[in-house]
């Protein structure tokens, strides 16, 4: 469902495996038209901050919410599985008021025990007046957030405040940050894993530990696989995102929990309050911090960040700027790959991975982050492909 940044015209959808364009009416129609079959792989998505389940309709060439009538948890788990989540991650199936939806996908109970997508049909009515909301993983929940603190020149984070934050080590040294999205998968920055660090055996991930001195051999998790975004550009830092798969899944607890990946339909506002965290330097050209630090930052709209006096058109749609134009608060060396998060509906969402900046905390040089919203489809594809 590569609608964003597709090489195809408005009416076409691109196959990832071949780059060819197919008609949207062939997308999710039960027949594979792409060589890799990906036109039938991503027919479900979660939409907006309420995780509303939507199914793509090849007839209407658009996404529609699923009516709650006759829905059950088994269908919910199947939909999450189709997105790339494993059964044992499944959290719950909720119900949300349809809030003015006029077109639904509904289960045809007389269709027999066919697969889920064969059972769904269009309906302009939904008798329960409720649509399906799915939590494929219990994500985005933390203990009370940290007190005001800063990565550059600030205070430390509180235990459990940023439970998705990991420290990624190479040979017992902190190199980059990362964010837990499932028990097995970590989001980090592609520039962290440039050759020769693209080999998984270099890397160990530490979760739930705030102090670097407590990160000793045996407490870490070995990395099994490193997947860098195929379109990452090391010069411009465009598409600066990577995934790490752990050899053994993490055990979640109060100090180790996943952050939520953003859903389509989540609108980010300029000046939206966000947080960054990491063990990066607390001053430009400084050493890695012993303790995890966190800071409040504001989103800066791309147009403003691309202005001549800031980054002069270096910011692409795959990047987000955050910080303060007057400086003082910023991520720094060693924070790379770590999270830029925001809270909506009492849930924490991963909207950026720390990527680059000119110096640290300088005026008119805010932090630049990978725009995770642009990469969620790619992330889910990797999770799916890994099975």
């Amino acid at each position: 469902w590569k609608f964003m940044g597709s090489k195809c015209s408005n009416s076409g959808i691109e196959c990832d495996s071949s780059g060819t364009c197919i008609n949207p009416s062939n997308w999710c129609d039960g027949v594979s038209h792409c060589p890799g079959g990906e036109d039938e792989n991503r027919c479900v998505r979660l939409y907006g901050p309420n995780f509303i389940l939507q199914v793509y309709s090849s007839q209407r060439k658009s996404w529609h919410p699923v009516c709650q009538d006759d829905w059950n948890e088994n269908y919910g788990r199947a939909a999450c599985r189709d997105m790339g989540y494993k059964n044992n991650f499944y959290s719950s199936q909720g119900i949300v008021d349809d809030s003015g939806s006029t077109s639904f996908m509904k289960l045809n109970t007389s269709a027999g025990n066919v697969d889920i997508y064969k059972k769904l049909y269009h309906s302009d009515a939904c008798s329960s007046k409720a649509v399906v909301s799915l939590r494929c993983i219990a994500c985005g929940v933390n203990l009370n957030s940290s007190r005001q603190s800063r990565i550059v020149g600030g205070e430390s984070a509180l235990p459990g405040a940023w439970p998705w934050q990991v420290s990624l080590h190479v040979q017992n040294v902190h190199v980059c940050g990362g964010s837990i999205i499932t028990p097995e998968w970590i989001v980090t920055a592609a520039h962290c894993v440039e050759k020769p660090l693209n080999n998984p055996w270099h890397w160990t991930a530490f979760a739930g530990i705030l102090r670097q001195s407590f990160m000793f051999y045996g407490a870490g998790y070995q990395v099994e696989k490193v997947i860098s975004h195929p379109n990452y550009d090391s010069k411009t830092k465009n598409n600066d995102i990577a995934l790490m798969k752990l050899q053994k899944p993490l055990t979640f607890n109060d100090l180790v929990k996943p952050v939520c990946l953003p859903n389509p339909g989540m609108m980010l506002q300029p000046e939206q309050l966000c947080w960054i965290s990491g063990w990066g330097a607390t001053e430009e050209k400084g050493k890695t911090s012993e303790v995890l630090n966190a800071a409040k930052v504001l989103l800066i709209e791309t147009q403003r960040c691309n202005s001549r006096y800031v980054y002069d058109n270096l910011i692409t749609p795959a990047m987000i700027c955050a910080g303060f134009l007057q400086g003082n608060v910023d991520s720094c060396q060693g924070d790379s790959g770590g999270p830029l998060v925001t809270s909506k509906n009492n849930i924490w969402w991963l909207i950026g991975d720390t990527s680059w900046g000119s110096g640290c905390a300088k005026a008119y040089r805010p932090g630049v982050y990978g725009n995770v919203m642009v990469f969620t489809d790619w992330i889910y594809r990797q999770m799916r492909a890994d099975g």
Epitope: G30, E40, D70, N72, N74, R81, G112, N113, V114, D115
Partner: antibody, heavy 117, light 106 residues
């Protein structure tokens, strides 16, 4: 008419593996999942897991995780159950059935697997 | 895990009489319940799905009712071919079968 025909009875030693096949006919194979259920002698029915023929996704009962594999071959419209590291209490009739997300209908005739040293 | 409890374990009924079988879920399964009949040496066959919808070809003497946690299968007038074991299956969250009710000739 819709039919599921299973392979014949098997006798296996403890620690061995068994592979049971289930040949489907009379319907569009990829439109339905296949579920496997077993029934020990004189006992009730136990859900083992299922596979979506449409996309190959599997779902296994926790009890069998790591020991079971379910696969399908769309060219021959056949589903397969493989159970490894067999123990004597795996002695049962193994049924395949059409459907994977809700109820199951119809069922294969069953395959008796006896595990004995 | 949702536990399905069937009662009674055995039901002795004369041909032509009414039989009422019960199935209770440990938590709500809404209407996601099916009933199966199994005869010795055979595979189970579907009678009812969605708690109350008769499967294709099932005689009208079989009826299902209930929702949530309490379900009933009623056979209005038992025929000789109806003596068998009956299982319920919940398919709301994973899949669990009841232990079965044997309907035998009185």
């Amino acid at each position: 008419q819709v039919q599921l025909v299973q392979s014949g009875a098997e006798v296996k030693k403890p620690g061995a593996s068994v592979r049971v096949s289930c040949k489907a006919s009379g319907y569009t194979f990829t439109n339905y999942g296949i579920t496997w259920v077993r029934q020990a002698p004189g006992q009730g029915l136990e859900w083992m897991g299922g596979i979506s023929v449409y996309n190959g996704n599997t779902e296994y009962a926790e009890k069998f995780q790591g020991r079971v594999s379910m696969t399908t071959d769309t060219s021959t419209t056949t589903a397969y159950l493989e159970l490894r590291s067999l123990k004597s209490d795996d002695t049962a009739v193994y049924f395949c059935a059409r459907g994977q997300l809700d109820y199951f209908d119809p069922w294969g005739q069953g395959t008796l697997v006896t595990v004995s040293s | 895990e949702i536990v399905m409890t069937q009662s009674p374990a055995t039901l002795s009924v004369s041909p032509g009489e009414r039989a009422t079988l019960s199935c209770r879920a440990s938590q709500s399964v809404r209407s996601n319940l099916a009933w199966y009949q199994q005869k010795p040496g055979q595979a189970p066959s579907l009678l009812i799905y969605g708690a109350s919808t008769r499967a294709t070809g099932i005689p009208a003497r079989f009826s299902g009712s209930g929702s949530g946690t309490e379900f009933t299968l009623t056979i209005s007038s038992l025929q000789s071919e109806d003596f068998a074991v009956y299982f319920c299956l919940q398919y709301n969250n994973w899949w669990t079968f009841g232990q079965g009710t044997k309907v035998e000739i009185k």
